[in-house]
Each structure stands twice: as C-alpha cells, then as structure tokens.
Interface confidence: medium
Amino acid sequence: MNGRVDYLVTEEEINLTRGPSGLGFNIVGGTDQQYVSNDSGIYVSRIKENGAAALDGRLQEGDKILSVNGQDLKNLLHQDAVDLFRNAGYAVSLRVQHRLQVQNGPIGHRGEGDPSGIPIFMVLVPVFALTMVAAWAFMRYRQQL
C-alpha cells in the first residue's frame, strides 16, 4: 500500500429490534475471507433500504461489528458469524466500531495490527501547539504597539 487512511475510532452499543424482514444488513469478513488485510473482523457491507438497521439509522456501511448480544465476533468463520446474527433473537444488541476518516491519502485498509486508527492526542497536540504559538505571537505584537 502506498500511504494510508487515518481514522478516529468510536464505539457504540446499538440495540435493534428484528423487523419483518430481519435486521436488514449484510456483512463481509471472517477468518476464511478477510475483507480487510490482516483483519478477520466482521464488517457491515450493505444496509438494506427500509430494513431495521436503516430505520434505526445508527449502523453504517463500513462499521466493524465487535459483538452480538455480548458474544465476541473475533476469529469466526464467515458463515459462523452469519449464523450468529440469524440466531440472535428478536432484540439484538450490537457493539459497533465506527471509523471516521480524518485524513485522505492513497487508500489502504487498517487492520487489527493497528486497530485504533489515529489517536485523538495526535490531532489535538498540534492544534494546541499552534494555538499557543499564535497567542504568543499576538502578545509580542501587542507589546510592540
């Protein structure tokens, strides 16, 4: 990969009620069909129009699903993960990882080897430093007046 995509990562608990046509989304991933290099996690690949997930509005395509009803999705075969969702019952609790892209570059996936994306302090420290420099420069300028 020539470059990378950086992410701010947040986690959320999403409780869905199974609708007439189910939960209303598709997944990719699993130990037998890694969707992201070096990451066998389960990702939301499609959200069906007017399905339970779409109507709830919080689950997004590209989200990583960490657990279903408290059951970890790590190291599962794709079909085993699918079966877990299908047998999850009427009320389904999903632990989800959202990734907000914060910097564009040549596209590359970030896998479990570096799961946290870009740490928040990596963004805040430069911003804070710039603010301090600007404040110092402003004070110096005022003293010269």
């Epitope: 046509s21 189910g22 989304f25 598709n26 997944i27 990719v28 969707y35 069906k48 699918v82």
Partner: nanobody, 127 residues
Framework: DVQLVESGGGLVQAGGSLRLSCAAS????????MAWYRQTPGKQRELVAR???????NYADSVKGRFTISRDNAKNTVYLQMNSLKPEDTAVYYC??????????????????????WGQGTQVTVS
C-alpha cells in the same frame, strides 16, 4: 465495480452438453448471489439458476435436473453445467452478480432487479 466475463457458449446438437463460465473481476466473497439468466429475441430475460454465498441454489423448473450451477471462490468464477440440451434452451445467457456480502437475515430470493452487475452475454445455440 465488478466486471463479469462469460465464456463457453457455442453451437451444440440436441442432447449435448456445454459448460458456461463467468469470471468476476473482484473476489466472490464480496458478492452475495450470482445467477445465470437467458433471453431469446422478443422475450423477457428469465432466471435459469442462482447460487448464494451460503451455497443455496435455485433453478427454473424448465432446467431442473439438467443444469447445475456452482461457484469457485478461489477462481472468482461461477459455472453453469448444461446437460441434455434442447432446442428451446437456445438463447443468450447472461451472468449476474449481487454485491454487498452476505445477508444476516436469510438466503432470501433475489429478484432480477436486485442484481448490481451483468455480463455481456454468451450465445448458446442448440440445433
């Protein structure tokens, strides 16, 4: 996007066999259903057979017991083995794919309008 390239069509005598192949440009892991449709001049395109990522298969009544659909994820290819061919099987055969992984709900029936990607078609003529 996924490009689909069909091959294997041709002219065959009644009672003969052909094997159609459809190669996808992207991994089949990201495709949740693939199908073969056929169309004859002046008629609507009709479903011949389909296979889901879960391995479920469905066939048109007219081809049951004669045609077999299968997929090879390693080669990103779906096949249609056609045996005991009849003159009425003459048509242009199209490969179709539905993107987006596997439904967490079921291997639901996939209608023609739900397919995202289509091949250019391959002619099968049974004399």
């Amino acid at each position: 996007d996924v490009q689909l390239v069909e091959s294997g069509g041709g002219l065959v005598q009644a009672g003969g066999s052909l094997r159609l192949s459809c190669a996808a440009s992207r991994t089949l892991f990201s495709i949740n259903a693939m199908a073969w449709y056929r169309q004859t001049p002046g008629k609507q395109r009709e479903l011949v057979a389909r296979v889901t990522s879960g391995g479920s298969t469905n066939y048109a009544d007219s081809v049951k017991g004669r045609f077999t659909i299968s997929r090879d994820n390693a080669k990103n290819t779906v096949y249609l083995q056609m045996n005991s061919l009849k003159p009425e099987d003459t048509a242009v055969y199209y490969c179709a794919a539905r993107g987006g992984g596997t439904s967490v709900d079921s291997d639901y029936d996939v209608e023609e309008f739900e397919y995202d990607y289509w091949g250019q078609g391959t002619q099968v003529t049974v004399s």
